[in-house]
Structures are given as structure tokens and as C-alpha cells.
């Protein structure tokens, strides 16, 4: 049922390659689950500019994931 699981992901499309660091309010990582079969990196932008999905394969996303994992474990 991969299509069903993918249909419930928060990010649609591949995500942006990068977000200006100065614009980032916070970063959230959603790990694969029953709802979505892929890792998702969601950036909350400053000044109520909404949220963006970051391409989890991008260099910036990999750095964020590493940073968050170091912090949590």
C-alpha cells in the first residue's frame, strides 16, 4: 500500500533544495510512519511566512537531520 501511505504525507512534491538560514524559525523532522513512508523535513519560516518542505536528500536537510539527531540522542 505505498501509494496510500504516500498520499498521507505532509509534504507534496520533492521539497525545496534549501531555505535561507536567516529565515528559519524552526525545523521539524517527521520520520517514516504508518501515515507516510518517507522522512519529511518541515521548516517553519520567520515572520509568519508559513512553512516549507525541504528535500530530505538535500545537503541542508541532511545537516539539519544530523543536528537534530545529535541533540536528541
Amino acid at each position: 500500500f505505498p501509494m496510500f501511505k504516500r498520499g498521507r504525507c505532509l509534504c507534496i512534491g520533492p521539497g525545496v533544495k534549501a531555505v535561507k538560514v536567516a529565515d528559519i524559525e524552526k525545523a521539524s523532522i517527521m520520520y517514516p510512519s504508518n501515515n507516510c513512508d518517507k522522512i519529511e523535513v518541515i521548516i517553519t519560516l520567520k515572520e509568519n511566512k508559513g512553512q516549507r518542505c525541504l528535500n530530505p536528500k538535500s545537503k541542508q536537510a541532511r545537516l539539519i537531520i544530523k543536528k537534530v539527531e545529535r541533540k536528541n540522542f
Epitope: M3, R6, G7, C9, L10, C11, I12, G13, P14, G15, V16, V19, I42, I43, N48, K49, G50, Q51, R52, C53, L54, N55
Partner: nanobody, 130 residues
Framework: EVQLVESGGGLVQAGGSLRLSCAAA?????????ISWFRQAPGKDREFVAA???????????EYADSVKGRFTISRDNAKNTAYLEMNSLKFEDTAVYYC???????????????????WGQGTQVTVSS
């Protein structure tokens, strides 16, 4: 950088049809872009009309504002890097400037929010006369 150019607007009688086009000047990842149409009537806020996004497989999903459901259809031709908004049974209330927007990093729950999109066209005027 994606540049979007809308066309196809004009003056039409109530009950008539129009087809708006949104051409992306630099294709690149057009296939995977979430494409949305918004509209803005004089003195009103920009409002969501329709969106279409890549399923991650070979199909697209679409979502519509309640006010246009069953009358408007969003589609795209990736070979031409162009998205379309087919508008049927037009009403006087559909009069507005129509904008297309594109983004690669759209969050599913925020698809109707203008701030979710990175690229915008200049708009095309649609006037429906009664």
C-alpha cells in the same frame, strides 16, 4: 528561478467558458511543482481556487475551493511546461484577477495558503458580465 506567465483571461458572459494558461519560462522541475490558481476580486483578499500536485508516482491529485467545484478543472501539460484552469458555467462572482502560483516545498495542510508558494505570475483579468 521559475517565471510564470498567465494568459487566456478576458470578458465573457455569465454561463460562458474560459481556459486560462500558466506557462513556466524555465521548466526544470515543473513536473513536480505544486501548481495552484488563486484569484483576487477588487477590494477583496486573494483567495484559493484550485491546486494540483504530484502524487510521487505517475498521477496528480487536485483540490478545489467549494465555490468552483464541478465548474473549474485544473490540469497541466508537462511537455509544454504549462498548467491550465478550465472554467465553465462562469458566474458574475468569478470576476477577478487570476494568478497561478508554483512551489516545490508545499505542506499538504497549507496548500490553500498563498504564503506556501515561491513563484507567482503577474495575473490575468477575468470579467464575467451578467
Amino acid at each position: 528561478e521559475v517565471q510564470l506567465v498567465e494568459s487566456g483571461g478576458g470578458l465573457v458572459q455569465a454561463g460562458g467558458s474560459l481556459r486560462l494558461s500558466c506557462a513556466a519560462a524555465s521548466g526544470g522541475t515543473f513536473t513536480k511543482q505544486t501548481i495552484s490558481w488563486f484569484r483576487q476580486a477588487p477590494g477583496k483578499d486573494r483567495e484559493f481556487v484550485a491546486a494540483q500536485w504530484w502524487s510521487g508516482l505517475s498521477t496528480y491529485f487536485a483540490e478545489y475551493a467549494d465555490s468552483v467545484k464541478g465548474r473549474f478543472t485544473i490540469s497541466r501539460d508537462n511537455a509544454k511546461n504549462t498548467a491550465y484552469l478550465e472554467m465553465n458555467s462562469l458566474k458574475f462572482e468569478d470576476t477577478a484577477v487570476y494568478y497561478c502560483a508554483a512551489g516545490l516545498g508545499v505542506v499538504r495542510t497549507l496548500i490553500r495558503r498563498a504564503s506556501s508558494y515561491d513563484y507567482w505570475g503577474q495575473g490575468t483579468q477575468v470579467t464575467v458580465s451578467s
